[in-house]
């Protein structure tokens, strides 16, 4: 396994609709044909997998149908979007990139993006 640098923003604020987007960029000394991207969430010293996708270079990322993640790739950048977030989902979201093919295998783990989610205030009842 060879180490690889992965960069991601330090902080992102989710939208009022519970959507957060960030870019995960990896620096490899060459072009892989098969890349796996995994989003991990670290909260209270526990790490859980949020979503994962394997893609062929030049093709779109394909997450599972029930995944809360979507994404696109461009060169060595992956644009990730996480949907359906609520205040309780606030935490550190870590981007893990694996170059699966060709060998050798490269692994890179970002420092994480702190995603802050604020639940919207419920709309007050209106007399109109």
């Amino acid at each position: 396994c060879k180490a690889m640098h992965v960069a991601q923003p330090a902080v992102v604020l989710a939208s009022s609709r519970g959507i957060a987007s960030f870019v995960c960029e990896y620096a490899s000394p060459g072009k892989a044909t098969e890349v796996r991207v995994t989003v991990l969430r670290q909260a209270d010293s526990q790490v859980t997998e949020v979503c994962a996708a394997t893609y062929m270079m030049g093709n779109e990322l394909t997450f599972l149908d029930d995944s809360i993640c979507t994404g696109t790739s461009s060169g060595n950048q992956v644009n990730l979007t996480i949907q359906g977030l609520r205040a309780m989902d606030t935490g550190l979201y870590i981007c893990k990139v694996e170059l699966m093919y060709p060998p050798p295998y490269y692994l890179g783990i970002g420092n994480g993006t702190q995603i802050y989610v604020i639940d919207p205030e419920p709309c007050p009842d209106s007399d109109f």
């Epitope: 620096a27 490899s28 000394p29 060459g30 072009k31 892989a32 170059l99 060709p102 060998p103």
Partner: antibody
């Protein structure tokens, strides 16, 4: 440590074939990476000639048309360059190199072998 | 083919100075650019990959920058051992292509 070493004749006659060997130590050429031939002309211009990948696939520079062939002997951990119908324009220093992926940075280079095409 | 142009064939600098070597790609190559140093009588040595990432063991006075079509290798606090020729290379697409080289001369 990974080492690449080129070998072959330093003088080739025009219209003949140029054949070079790259011997690799410290890493199996079937385990990974892409294994290239690059040449440097007088004046220092560099040209990528082609590669053979860890799984035996090849890719060549279109500028060399059908003159080039890269093969390997996995039992000896060597790969080879054959360039047919050479002219004086093929006089150069020839390097074998290694890079990651399909398109990448050459992280290891041989010391190079000078080839002169002359009658 | 993608053409990599290093417009300055020679650059002269002094020990302790800062010098920037430039490279222009004929089309967008993202950050798929490498830089090499070649000292007289030696093979090229990889310095930078992915436009801005140093290889292990490369002194931090070497810095790569740029994306798209314009790239720069900056050497700060130039040392006498930096006397060499510097080449850029694109690896966005085949055939892989190199710049023509920039020779650094130390005054």
């Amino acid at each position: 440590d990974v080492q690449l070493q080129e070998s072959g004749p330093g003088l080739v006659k025009p219209s003949q074939s140029l054949s070079l060997t790259c011997s690799v130590t410290g890493y199996s050429i079937t385990s990974g990476y892409v294994w290239n031939w690059i040449r440097q002309f007088p004046g220092n211009k560099l040209e990528w000639m082609g590669y053979i990948s860890h799984d035996g696939n090849t890719n060549y520079n279109p500028s060399l048309k059908n003159r080039i062939s890269i093969t390997r002997d996995t039992s000896k951990n060597q790969f080879f360059l054959k360039l047919n119908s050479v002219t004086t324009e093929d006089s150069a220093t020839y390097y074998c190199t290694r890079n990651y992926g399909y398109g990448g940075t050459m992280d290891y280079w041989g010391q190079g072998t000078a080839v002169s095409v002359s009658s | 083919d993608i053409v990599m142009t290093q417009s300055q064939k020679f650059m002269s600098t002094s020990v302790g100075d800062r010098v920037s070597v430039t490279c222009k790609a004929s089309q967008n190559v993202g950050t798929y650019v490498a830089w090499y140093e070649q000292k007289l009588g030696q093979s090229p040595k990889a310095l930078i990959f992915s436009a801005s990432y140093r290889y292990t063991g490369v002194p931090d006075r070497f810095t790569g920058s740029g994306s798209g079509t314009d790239f720069t290798l900056t050497i700060s606090n130039v040392q006498s051992e930096d006397l060499a020729e510097y080449f850029c290379q694109q690896y966005d697409s085949y055939p892989l292509t190199f710049g023509g080289g920039t020779k650094l001369e130390i005054k």
